[in-house]
């Protein structure tokens, strides 16, 4: 199983739940349906996971291979600065944003984009295989 604190990465684990994709040491869920940001977050939390928190450019580039033009919600919000749901600041990439009212973050194959949080979009959850300890 996975080791470490809530915000650690996972140790190498054998497999992921049904309909989840294993990539590196994490499991990723790419939704088929669309929800607003808060509902997407709730969906992930209910499955012992979290809305996608991207740790670095390498992970972002790898994930973008699986994305299209359609935007997906990720665990990124603007609360006096863009921060991931684990509390860390967005510092390895830029987010396209020039509106005060667009405070939730999304991703597509081209990069990060701010949006109004109530827009229904696809979403991406991330978790450790068969573990509820290390969410990110």
């Amino acid at each position: 199983l996975c080791q470490g604190s809530n915000y650690s990465t996972c140790a190498s684990c054998p497999s992921c739940p049904d309909r989840w994709m294993k990539y590196g040491n994490h499991c990723y869920y790419f939704s088929v349906e669309e929800k607003d940001w808060n509902s997407s977050l709730e969906f992930c939390l209910a499955r012992d996971s979290h809305l996608l928190v991207i740790t670095d450019n390498q992970e972002m580039s790898l994930l973008q291979v699986f994305l299209s033009e359609a935007f997906c919600w990720i665990g990124l919000r603007n609360n006096s600065g863009w921060r991931w749901e684990d509390g860390s600041p967005l510092n390895f990439s830029r987010i396209s944003s020039n509106s005060f009212v667009q405070t939730c973050g999304a991703i597509n194959k081209n990069g990060l984009q701010a949006s109004s949080c109530e827009v229904p979009l696809h979403w991406v959850c991330k978790k450790c295989p068969f573990a509820d300890q290390a969410l990110f």
Epitope: S96, S99, V101, Q102, Q113, S115, S116, P120
Partner: antibody
Framework: QVILKESGPGLVKPTQTLTLTCTFS??????????IGWIRQPPGKALEWLAH???????SYNSALKSRLTISKDTSKNQVVLTMTNMDPVDTATYYC?????????????????WGQGTTVTVSS | DILMTQSPLSLPVTPGEPASISCRSS???????????LEWYLQKPGQSPRLLIY???NRFSGVPDRFSGSGSGTDFTLKISRVEAEDVGVYYC?????????FGAGTKLELK
């Protein structure tokens, strides 16, 4: 810095077609969630929404004026154009463009954060 | 179309005193997503309108905290805790929850 600027003929004769252009900078109308709307204000009267267009070319019109209005965009020029046919003296107004934000409904919008200075249109023979 | 009714239409206020503007919608303007897209705009003399409040009670960037919005359903209020000379102009409420988006007739705030 977001800037919008309206331009138009100033004076239009009754029955003629009005063409208004909104030229903007500081953002792209290809960006997800961005839109531009047109709002008018007759002298001494309230504001009235006319039409808007989204980044994905979805459009919506004031139902009472729909048959007379056409909105389009030219993203390469950063412009949105509104045409209004069969102009009448009651269409005399200041016409504004404003940036609008998408919240999941293409037919309406919220948060007109940025407005142009407005262009005055007088309809008279 | 949803009718937005503002009152009063004219509001003389002494500088430093509070002011309150009411906006009533002809039907409930809670959107099916749970949000209420009720906004307040101020149009100063000779200027374009500018956004003050969005989604009922959220102050837009740079708007002084003497401005506050409240309400739900069909009844909404814009309050200015202490009116200043620069607050003079016409205040409009706006709803974007339902099609078509509509404005109120405006409330003209002037100094006594």
């Amino acid at each position: 810095q977001v800037i919008l600027k309206e331009s138009g003929p100033g004076l239009v004769k009754p029955t003629q077609t009005l063409t208004l252009t909104c030229t903007f900078s500081g953002f792209s109308l290809t960006t997800f969630g961005m839109g531009i709307g047109w709002i008018r204000q007759p002298p001494g009267k309230a504001l009235e929404w006319l039409a808007h267009i989204w980044w994905n070319d979805d459009k919506s019109y004031n139902s009472a004026l729909k048959s007379r209005l056409t909105i389009s965009k030219d993203t390469s020029k950063n412009q949105v154009v509104l045409t209004m046919t069969n102009m009448d003296p009651v269409d005399t107004a200041t016409y504004y463009c404003a940036r609008t934000i998408y919240y999941g409904n293409y037919l309406t919008f919220y948060a007109m954060e940025h407005w142009g200075q407005g262009t005055t249109v007088t309809v008279s023979s | 179309d949803i009718l937005m009714t503002q009152s009063p239409l004219s509001l003389p206020v002494t500088p430093g005193e509070p002011a309150s503007i009411s906006c009533r919608s002809s039907q409930n303007i809670v959107h099916s997503n749970g949000n209420t897209y009720l906004e307040w705009y101020l149009q100063k003399p000779g200027q374009s309108p500018r956004l003050l409040i969005y989604k009922v009670s959220n102050r837009f960037s740079g708007v002084p905290d003497r401005f506050s919005g409240s309400g739900s359903g069909t009844d909404f209020t814009l309050k200015i805790s202490r009116v200043e000379a620069e607050d003079v102009g016409v205040y409009y409420c706006f709803q974007g929850s339902h099609v078509p988006p509509t404005f109120g007739a405006g409330t003209k705030l002037e100094l006594k």
